[in-house]
């Protein structure tokens, strides 16, 4: 507890002090007062810097003093034979003596005081900035009119921070400015725009004159502006040493101006404006800013159009322009945003062809289609080449973003049918031979493949079976080569208007119009042994005459069996319709009259008893293309005959090009168009 | 007058090879599917291989699927049996017939013996 | 594969007998049968075609009749000439396959 005073005394005193003895006494007195330490008698073992035996006297880490030996006063109004005078409030006294003594020593008396100290005077570091009051115990800080006592009570400043600045302009400038700044000061003022606007502040050198930096460059008075996580300065100096202009890039400002005790000067005065908030103009790849300017600044709204091309994606949905706003931050809108190449994506498949999977899909590249050859081509036209164009759609010179289409190549066998003599007098075949046969298994007849989706055939075929089951693609008929080969199903059958329908079709004498078309449910994939047969052309290139040669293809009647198991086939020659007139009906069903006889007919045979016959009904009679000899054309189909191995009748295609064409195209799928 | 001639015949070792030949007169060969068939000493007969008239269809038996390859040249009148991969089993005597149409085989040759011994 | 079953394997007869052979399909071959003569040290003889039609030149003591699956071959009056083995053979299918045979002999 701290005591105003009190005695020290050896140990033992005033007899003489014990060898060997180390005692320490802590003097405290209170807060605000130093302490008078001074003794009365000193009688200790005198050696060289009171090695043996010593009083010592410690405050805090200083040795205030050391003593031995004898010592009188030197006043004779006083018995102090030694004094300290320290100015804190705490001491330490330490006696120590040694193993020996040679003499008597008696030790020493000590008193010590509580005196007051002057901290206004005393002390190297001077406890107020301004104005020091002394008093016992303590002393207190004050300040010059208009200054106040911050916190600490120990330093006055001026009060010159709070202020907040949100007008679009206004000036600022520091305490008395252009008479000296106060001293020992932080004024700290605070500029706030609205968003969007940046704090723009403009100096004039000769307005500024802070304390200068000292040796080691750094500012004892400064200027300091804060924006953010962004600071220009401190600035301090004669004449200001930063930019004259300062963009701050933002719409909060703070500005910071500290002094310190000395060195005072005129100050500062600045400006300050808020500028629309600048959006830098980027460089955005593939694209065009619109308007075009060479400054952007807050609200400012550019349409950024990609180049032909390119495509901004966002999300699913691609766009060629999007929108850009200027922000309030300094940052453009939708700036994730970027054109990039259009994507034309994987090309679409088509039927009976293939696209190479392509090394890109992007802006620019480019792709072929093909068809399956030597059964399909591409029908319309353009090569097949398309290029990822802009709007994102694969492209064709010719055909623009419509695909191509891959159509069977009519009238190519894959192999050559080569005449041997066995039909009636005709030859084994092989399905190659006549791709385009059809087989009927109800009634056992004929047909030819006209398309994907179409089957030519004689109407008194399908007249009686109207769901006609049929086969292709097989030269053996057995159930085990048909089940292996590809069977195609009706949709509906379609009888030339121009057919007489009749109550007892065995009596039939008039064949006229014996044309009929099928429509199958499915398309047919044309090979090697299913390809279609051409049509007849409308001009008169494809006019028969006398003696030109057909071929017709079949499974009916032979020589030896009722109906042949193997394809079989004979190359015929028109003949005169009179031919066909003067050949006597096998087996009459009426008088030879009868029997009707049109130009919707085409007479042939007659040659070393080649000839079609029952169960080849509706075959077609192919006859060479005139235009293209690699090509075969339905010139005519298997319809009826007076006698089987001498002539034969068959419908004329090319007087139903037409109804052909029509009843197809009426009655195509949508996919077909 | 029709004939047909085979050849080739003779013994061999399992594994080894052979090669049939039947030459064609008489006819027009290539107006005719043929057909080789084969009749293991007492058994009965065997069918082993046909082609058709161009030679772009051809049948085997599965007893003798990838080893034995059927050929014609219709220019020579001739009809060709590669035979590889030889077996016991394979022992007989090898007709080549001609099909007269659908399937009916109605003038055969005189036959050629293939022996597999080792 | 469709297997043809033949019987008798043989049979004995005397000359002017009538003779019957069956051949049992294993699956129906509707009438894609053919019958075959076999005479010793000989190549076979295509006699049938199409399970009933006689091929040219073949005497009319010979028939054939059947449908589907069971098919017979008849003799109707045993000649010395006639002692052969018969064969039936399939062409509903590939592979083409024969009967065992009847070998047919005489009393």
């Known amino acids: 507890e701290p005591t105003m005073y009190g005695e020290i005394l050896s140990p033992n005193y005033p007899q003489a002090y014990p060898s060997e003895v180390e005692k320490s006494w802590d003097i405290e007195v209170p807060e605000g007062y130093g302490i008078h330490l001074y003794f009365t008698h000193l009688d200790i073992e005198l050696s060289e810097n009171c090695a043996y035996d010593s009083v010592q006297i410690i405050s805090g880490d200083t040795e205030e003093g050391r003593l031995c030996g004898q010592r009188s006063s030197n006043n004779p109004h006083s018995p102090i034979v030694e004094e300290f005078q320290v100015p804190y409030n705490k001491l330490q006294v330490i006696f120590k003596s040694d193993f020996s003594n040679e003499e008597r020593f008696t030790g020493f008396a000590a008193y010590y005081v509580a005196t007051d100290i002057n901290e206004c005077t005393d002390f190297v570091d001077v406890p107020c900035s301004h104005f020091c009051n002394n008093f016992i115990g303590g002393y207190f800080c004050s300040c010059p009119p208009e200054y106040f006592l911050h916190d600490d009570m120990k330093n006055c400043g001026v009060n010159c921070s709070g202020d907040v600045f949100t007008a679009l302009i206004g000036e600022i400038a520091s305490p008395n400015y252009p008479k000296p700044y106060p001293e020992n000061s932080r004024c700290e003022y605070q500029i706030r725009l609205e968003k969007g606007f940046q704090v723009v502040v403009t100096l004039r050198r000769e307005d500024f004159d802070v304390e200068a930096a000292d040796s080691a460059g750094n500012c004892l008075d400064s200027l300091v502006f804060v924006a953010g996580d962004r600071q220009f300065g401190p600035y301090c100096g004669h004449g200001f040493p930063g930019p004259l202009n300062i963009e701050t890039k933002s719409n909060a400002l703070d500005i910071i101006f500290q002094t310190d005790l000395t060195g005072q000067k005129k100050g500062w005065k600045l400006r300050y404006h808020g500028d629309p908030m600048p959006c830098p103009k980027e460089d955005t790849p593939n694209s065009v800013w619109e308007p075009a300017k060479a400054k952007y600044v807050f609200r400012d709204v550019v349409q950024i159009t990609c180049l032909d091309g390119f495509e901004v994606v966002e999300g699913r949905v691609g766009a060629t322009s999007f929108y850009s706003t200027c922000q309030s931050n300094g940052k453009w809108s939708n700036s994730k945003l970027k054109c990039q190449p259009v994507d034309c994506g994987i090309p679409e498949s088509i039927e009976n062809g293939k696209v190479e999977d392509p090394e890109s899909t992007l802006f620019g590249s480019v792709i072929r289609y093909t068809c399956e050859e030597p059964y399909y081509y591409m029908e319309n036209g353009g090569g097949g080449e398309y290029h990822c164009a802009g709007n994102g759609s694969w492209v064709n010179e010719v055909l623009g973003p419509e695909l191509p289409k891959c159509v069977p190549v009519c009238g190519v066998p894959r192999e050559p049918f080569e005449e041997k003599q066995r039909i009636i007098g005709g030859s084994d075949a092989d399905i190659k031979n006549f791709p385009w046969q059809v087989f009927f298994d109800n009634p056992w007849a004929g047909g030819a493949l006209i398309n994907e989706y179409w089957v030519l055939t004689a109407a008194h075929v399908v007249e009686g079976n109207r769901e006609p089951t049929m086969y292709v693609g097989s030269t053996s008929v057995q159930t085990s080569r048909l089940a292996k080969s590809k069977m195609l199903t009706p949709e509906h059958v379609f009888i030339h208007p121009g057919w007489k329908l009749l109550e007892v079709p065995e009596g039939r004498t008039n064949f006229d119009n014996d044309i009929a078309l099928v429509r199958l449910k499915d398309p047919v994939k044309m090979g090697p042994t299913v390809s279609p047969i051409c049509l007849p052309g409308t001009s008169s290139d494809y006019n028969l005459m006398d003696g030109d040669l057909g071929l017709i293809s079949g499974w009916g009647r032979t020589e030896k069996r009722d109906r042949a198991v193997r394809l079989k086939a004979a190359r015929l020659p028109v003949a005169p319709l009179r031919k066909c007139k003067e050949v006597k009906v096998e087996k009459p069903t009426a008088d030879a009259e009868a029997y009707v006889f049109t130009p919707n007919m085409i007479c042939a045979g007659g040659e070393k008893g080649m000839d079609s016959c029952k169960g080849d009904s509706g075959g077609a009679f192919a006859v060479q293309d005139p235009n293209d000899k690699t090509k075969f054309y339905a010139a005519g189909l298997v319809s009826w005959g007076p006698q089987c191995g001498t002539y034969g009748l068959y419908t004329r295609v090319k007087n139903y090009v037409d109804w052909i064409m029509k009843t197809m195209q009426e009655n195509s799928t949508p996919r077909e168009d | 007058q029709v004939q047909l001639v085979e050849s080739g015949g003779g013994l061999v070792k399992p594994g080894g090879s052979l090669r049939l030949s039947c030459a064609a007169s008489?006819?027009?060969?290539?107006?005719?599917?043929m057909s080789w068939i084969r009749q293991a000493p007492g058994k009965g007969l065997e069918w082993v291989s046909y082609?058709?008239?161009?030679?772009?269809?051809?049948y085997y038996a599965d007893s003798v699927k990838g080893r034995f390859t059927i050929s014609r040249d219709n220019a020579k009148n001739s009809l060709y049996l590669q035979m590889n991969s030889l077996r016991a089993e394979d022992t007989a005597v090898y007709y080549c017939?001609?099909?007269?149409?659908?399937?009916?085989?109605?003038?055969w040759g005189q036959g050629t013996l293939v022996t597999v011994s080792s | 594969d469709i297997q043809m079953t033949q019987s008798p394997s043989s049979l004995s007869a005397s000359v002017g007998d009538r003779v019957t052979i069956t051949c049992q399909a294993s699956?129906?071959?509707?009438?894609?049968l053919n019958w075959y003569q076999q005479k010793p040290g000989k190549a076979p003889k295509l006699l049938i075609y199409?399970?009933?039609n006689l091929e040219t030149g073949v005497p009319s003591r010979f028939s054939g009749s059947g449908s589907g699956t069971d098919f017979t071959f008849t003799i109707s009056s045993l000649q010395p000439e006639d002692i052969a083995t018969y064969y039936c053979?399939?062409?509903?299918?590939?592979?083409?396959?024969f009967g065992g045979g009847t070998k047919v002999e005489i009393k």
């Open positions: 199409d399970a009933s």
């Open positions: 017939a001609r099909d007269e149409t659908d399937y009916a085989f109605d003038e």
């Open positions: 082609i058709s008239r161009s030679g772009s269809t051809k």
């Open positions: 008489g006819f027009t060969f290539s107006d005719y599917y």
């Open positions: 699956q129906d071959i509707s009438n894609y």
């Open positions: 053979k399939q062409y509903e299918d590939y592979p083409l396959t």
